[in-house]
Interface confidence: medium
């Protein structure tokens, strides 16, 4: 016989609860955890349950993106009576359990953070011994990954009428502001920030018409730092080509 409950309410502290006479499931997760790219982060998750002194088999699961259906990033299983939760899945080997599920703690450590880790995570616990039950955080914890700017691509491309244009793409969180500088541009030219669809941390700025030979520099800056990269434009034989 499998008995199950899911959370039906949530207060401002992200304590997710299901209550009925003589039983109570709840999960406590913070709304958000922030950390810098390259560092590690801890996603806290603790729970309470109605099955007193349960020591049967259990599984701890973390998934990303959406509850119930999102891809699992971590899973471990503990045998009856065991406090060791044996890891069965750790995406890219970067996820490990910090908490002890036997003590109602599913807290997870994420190593070597990348901007792609910036998403919502959901903890879940399953009992499968004499008692069968499961519970999952429905609202989860948002992992907010910050990063200093990094220019990921800078290039000069041909455009109509033998002209050239320059593109600069940078990533960072907060999304960096981009600026171009170069011959006849003055000190700098601020570019309109345009995050690319589906790539929320990527920003691209275009210099539509390069009118002079020389060095063009793209600068990316946010509250965590700045980065710059340059391209060189040299036109030969009446603008029939360019060296960059």
């Amino acid at each position: 016989f499998v008995r199950t409950k899911i959370d039906t309410t949530e207060n401002l502290l992200n304590t997710e609860v299901h209550s009925s006479p003589a039983q109570r499931w709840s999960m406590q997760v913070p709304p958000e955890v922030s950390a810098e790219a390259g560092d590690a982060a801890v996603l806290p998750c603790t729970f309470t349950h109605p099955h007193r002194h349960y020591d049967g088999p259990l599984t701890a699961i973390w998934r990303a993106g959406e509850p119930y259906a999102g891809p699992q990033v971590f899973r471990c299983a503990a045998a009856r009576g065991s406090e060791l939760c044996q890891t069965a899945l750790s995406l890219h080997g970067r996820f490990r359990l910090l908490g002890n599920p036997r003590r109602n703690d599913l807290s997870l450590r994420v190593e070597r953070l990348a901007l792609a880790d910036d998403r919502r995570y959901f903890c879940r616990v399953e009992f499968a011994g004499d008692v069968h039950d499961r519970y999952e955080s429905r609202h989860g914890v948002r992992l907010h990954v910050t990063a200093a700017p990094r220019i990921v691509n800078i290039s000069v491309l041909p455009s109509p009428a033998h002209a050239f244009r320059a593109l600069c793409t940078a990533e960072g969180e907060p999304p960096p502001a981009l600026a171009w500088s170069g011959p006849a541009l003055g000190n700098s030219l601020a570019a309109v920030r345009s995050p690319r669809e589906g790539h929320g941390h990527l920003v691209t700025a275009e210099l539509p018409a390069l009118t002079h030979d020389g060095r063009y520099t793209c600068t990316a800056a946010n509250s965590l730092g700045r980065s710059e990269a340059s391209v060189y434009l040299f036109r030969f034989h009446g603008a029939s080509g360019a060296s960059t």
Partner: antibody, heavy 122, light 107 residues
Framework: EVQLLESGGGLVQPGGSLRLSCAAS????????MSWVRQAPGKGLEWVST????????YYADSVKGRFTISRDNSKNTLYLQMNSLRAEDTAVYYC???????????????WGQGTMVTVSS | DIQMTQSPSSVSASVGDRVTITCRAS??????LAWYQQKPGKAPKLLIY???SLQSGVPSRFSGSGSGTDFTLTISSLQPEDFATYYC?????????FGQGTKLEIK
């Protein structure tokens, strides 16, 4: 492509046996509980059996308990249903289905095979 | 075992109509309810899970609501491809059980 492909159905006499297979591709089936669901001709859906991701826990409908055995070979990403002592009322299309939830439970069945027909008749 | 009862057992409607199908559980199942669509000769397709979560790739005209014992599947504006049979299913306890189905036919 993520899919499930059943095989092994056919015509069998009452009291006979069949073994159904379900090959999973495009995902690691060991991460998920897997189930068999059947549908008799012109009738509704009936849950038959579920097995946990690791294969250590199995569950059966009362109508098949003691006659059917669910198993899995995670190295082959394959689910099985061994059906013994078959009866006329077991005649149905048998679907294998993946649990959306996780390794022990089925919060819903989010991926289904195309089904394989089992006919029990003399 | 938990009994799942769907109503109506069949319904006739036209393209563009709003259709509601209900499912009642014989005991409290919290939100552990899924809805499926099945067309003749095809496998069921998951539409809604945990009562109200829309499965990826399913059009937003489908929605689910309810908790406890009473649940509803709503199709806000029927499209020609929506004519099929719909099943609810509880995953609160084993044995998992399905409703008897609701056949949605063209008026």
């Amino acid at each position: 492509e993520v899919q499930l492909l059943e095989s092994g159905g056919g015509l069998v006499q009452p009291g006979g046996s069949l073994r159904l297979s379900c090959a999973a591709s495009g995902f690691t089936s060991s991460s998920y509980a897997m189930s068999w669901v059947r549908q008799a001709p012109g009738k509704g859906l009936e849950w038959v059996s579920t097995i946990s991701g690791g294969g250590g826990s199995t569950y059966y409908a009362d109508s098949v308990k003691g006659r059917f055995t669910i198993s899995r070979d995670n190295s082959k990403n394959t689910l099985y249903l061994q059906m013994n002592s078959l009866r006329a009322e077991d005649t149905a299309v048998y679907y294998c289905a993946k649990a959306i939830g996780s390794s022990w439970y089925s919060d819903a069945f989010d991926l289904w095979g195309q089904g394989t027909m089992v006919t029990v008749s003399s | 075992d938990i009994q799942m009862t769907q109503s109506p057992s069949s319904v006739s409607a036209s393209v563009g109509d709003r259709v509601t199908i209900t499912c009642r559980a014989s005991q409290d199942i919290s939100s552990w309810l899924a809805w499926y669509q099945q067309k003749p000769g095809k496998a069921p397709k998951l539409l809604i899970y945990v009562a109200s979560s829309l499965q990826s790739g399913v059009p937003s005209r489908f929605s689910g609501s309810g908790s406890g014992t009473d649940f509803t599947l709503t199709i806000s504006s029927l499209q020609p491809e929506d004519f099929a049979t719909y099943y609810c299913q509880q995953s609160y306890s084993i044995p998992y059980t399905f409703g008897q189905g609701t056949k949605l036919e063209i008026k």
